[in-house]
Interface confidence: low
Amino acid sequence: QLTTESMPFNVAEGKEVLLLVHNLPQQLFGYSWYKGERVDGNRQIVGYAIGTQQATPGPANSGRETIYPNASLLIQNVTQNDTGFYTLQVIKSDLVNEEATGQFHVYPELPKPSISSNNSNPVEDKDAVAFTCEPETQDTTYLWWINNQSLPVSPRLQLSNGNRTLTLLSVTRNDTGPYECEIQNPVSANRSDPVTLNVTYGPDTPTISPSDTYYRPGANLSLSCYAASNPPAQYSWLINGTFQQSTQELFIPNITVNNSGSYTCHANNSVTGCNRTTVKTIIVTELSPVVAKPQIKASKTTVTGDKDSVNLTCSTNDTGISIRWFFKNQSLPSSERMKLSQGNTTLSINPVKREDAGTYWCEVFNPISKNQSDPIMLNVNYNALPQENGLSPG
């Protein structure tokens, strides 16, 4: 059976296509090619008489066609208008005709696409952004890339318009991109230049650094404020509610106790119209903000009841501190047998009784801090009473 084959089937615009003929019958008088799916004299491209080896152009000949003795037809410099069906009519010597129809598709070489956006400065959690891949062309596949990766599955990402439009619902600050679109058809492919989004957001709640609360008199107070924001936030400082200055950093040299108070950082984003504040308490004091853990020692840890006495000592290197004592979570002294001396550093128990056995610890403190020692265990023994007969046990 007479058949035709297009080589290639998908042709790039400006290239050439060869309509090959298979199973050509013997004893031929000639053949003709027609544009379309049927024989139509008005749409004849070329006729060929085998006897004279003469090719005769028809009404549909564009000058780009070449017919070969084997009936194949070459069309050069194809255009999209050449897309479609082509019919070969073979005239046999017995004047009985045979026909075969083939087709091919011409696609344009795709241009470099570009991305248009309906909003290049969206506001976080408020605006949606629609990207459109230009130009719109027929028989084209559209693909999108974010951060050089294919689109993640996300309810906030929607494709429409034959994948030509990518919509970001409720943008976040992480949606800056870059975004690229790729267009493809069977004969070519091209990708756009990257496009980035300028997402407006913030300010977030500001952070004041450093985190220190306590400062000694004479030190320099240097505070810095930062809030994530686009465009960058504008900052101002208030001390005890009174405006000080519009800067990101606050510097006060040689502070005194009078500089204690509430320090407020105010961050403002003029585009989003949002404000955020953070308050930090600063305490200027001679006292140590961190009291070291005291050490507790006992003159003995095992004593004889009603006979021995014991001294417990609480040691610390800190100055300006006070000391208190605890026994079984009770504050001491709790009886006349217990005495505190040397600024409460020493607890004396004289004499020790059975009820004094247990855990003791001391605590050192100042108005702004405190710390307590590890506990120490006091054991109280009693000598065995003599037997009624005066004999020792044994």
């Epitope: 470099k112 693909l143 890339w145 050089n148 990766q149 294919s150 993640p152 690229e180 790729e182 492919a189 091209n190 990708r191 990257p194």
Partner: antibody, heavy 127, light 110 residues
Framework: EVQLLESGGGLVQPGGSLRLSCAAS????????MSWVRQAPGKGLEWVSW????????YYADSVKGRFTISRDNSKNTLYLQMNSLRAEDTAVYYC????????????????????WGQGTLVTVSS | QSVLTQPPSASGTPGQRVTISCSGS????????VTWYQQLPGTAPKLLIY???HRPSGVPDRFSGSKSGTSASLAISGLRSEDEADYYC???????????FGGGTKLTVL
Amino acid sequence: EVQLLESGGGLVQPGGSLRLSCAASGFTFSGYDMSWVRQAPGKGLEWVSWISYGGGSIYYADSVKGRFTISRDNSKNTLYLQMNSLRAEDTAVYYCAKDRLPQKAVRHSYANGMDVWGQGTLVTVSS
Amino acid sequence: QSVLTQPPSASGTPGQRVTISCSGSSSNIGNNYVTWYQQLPGTAPKLLIYADSHRPSGVPDRFSGSKSGTSASLAISGLRSEDEADYYCGAWDYSLSGYVFGGGTKLTVL
């Protein structure tokens, strides 16, 4: 017609060296990123190395890093794979492959897949 | 052990629909396009599906690709004897800085 033709395979002893070539025709070689992929007898495909269209960016599989070197000569339309310190486990058919999209269209083309492959060249490492 | 996981074999009778799965992670399939390759016996691999689901010209529409999360699949409908081949999935892996293949699936047409 777009074609890739590998050569340079053969029998080599463990520890030896071999240089594979891949001659490209039918397309603008200098516009495409290229890869080497190998297939051990009866096994699956294993990506070996990738080189950008101009040779400025290169990646290797961990299994060949430090032993194999990929390069290209765009003036000769040829891709190369220099293989040193060969081991028995390097025995395979080595294919060169062309990236699907031209670099002019792509910023990170290694995500696009390989659309044209050579017929392969067999490398046998044995004593 | 391949980075992408495929079943070693699959089979079907002529005219049937067969699906081959490919499982990966967020560093490869989850964040990149998947490509499928067909390797007929004794020949070099051939590009079958690119960008998760797109067919190059010349590949019959009986072949289709899809992806969900970190898994991809290749479906072949109207199975034919000439479809008997090895099928491989592939993707770029950002954490490995390299291209990774599945172990391959041998499709038998019964």
